[in-house]
């Protein structure tokens, strides 16, 4: 789990499909600070 101040964690039910792929729920990438703007 990401516990730095720059991480936005998303513990949302159904995020992973049964196949292990990511469901396209338009959630925000977890590590905001590693991305420029």
């Amino acid at each position: 789990a990401c516990d730095t101040a720059t991480c936005v964690t998303h513990r949302l039910a159904g995020l992973l499909s049964r196949s292990g792929g990511v469901v396209k729920n338009n959630f925000v990438p977890t590590n905001v600070g590693s991305k420029a703007f």
């Epitope: 936005v8 338009n26 590693s34």
Partner: antibody, heavy 115, light 108 residues
Amino acid sequence: EVQLQQSGPELVKPGASVKMSCKASGYTFTSSVMHWVKQKPGQGLEWIGYINPYNDGTKYNEKFKGKATLTSDKSSSTAYMELSSLTSEDSAVYYCAKGGNDGYWGQGTTLTVSS
Amino acid sequence: EIVLTQSPTTMAASPGEKITITCSASSSISSIYLHWYQQKPGFSPKVLIYRASNLASGVPARFSGSGSGTSYSLTIGTMEAEDVATYYCQQGSTIPFTFGSGTKLEIK
């Protein structure tokens, strides 16, 4: 084409509040955070904070807590920043910027605080 | 907060010259959190380099970035007139995110 369209220039009196907008288009609004950055005339860049439009979560620079309030409206793909108790120190250009390495910034909103 | 100190503050270079701008952080940061921006007079900033060494889309290959820990640099391989601008480093390792104070690049 991704675009961030910011609201027009504001001239307000000391002590008042102002709410500026940043309308996003060309991408899924809830898929990226929206940052806000301050630039005083002839000076450098200062990060105010960001909002996650997916869940309205916010992170602020401590310096701007109580000064800036970030909100968003998913239905119109618009991010807002309200600045309160304005003083001359708040006179600046304020930018919104999409998080995500692709470098999309609004054109800036010029705020002038003067009596 | 993490303070980013840029050097030099201002500089003038001739066309074709190689330019290096440095960014020193007050605390060590991972390179994935260090980004560079260019701002031309009267325009919004734009990202040049993200995660210390990755060239942003549409940025000419004469720009490059490197570094680790507390020391990072932006290099322009051959200065061109269109590179006249102010350059900022920025860290996303710790909130508040912070920018360097800027390096103003002029042409001789």
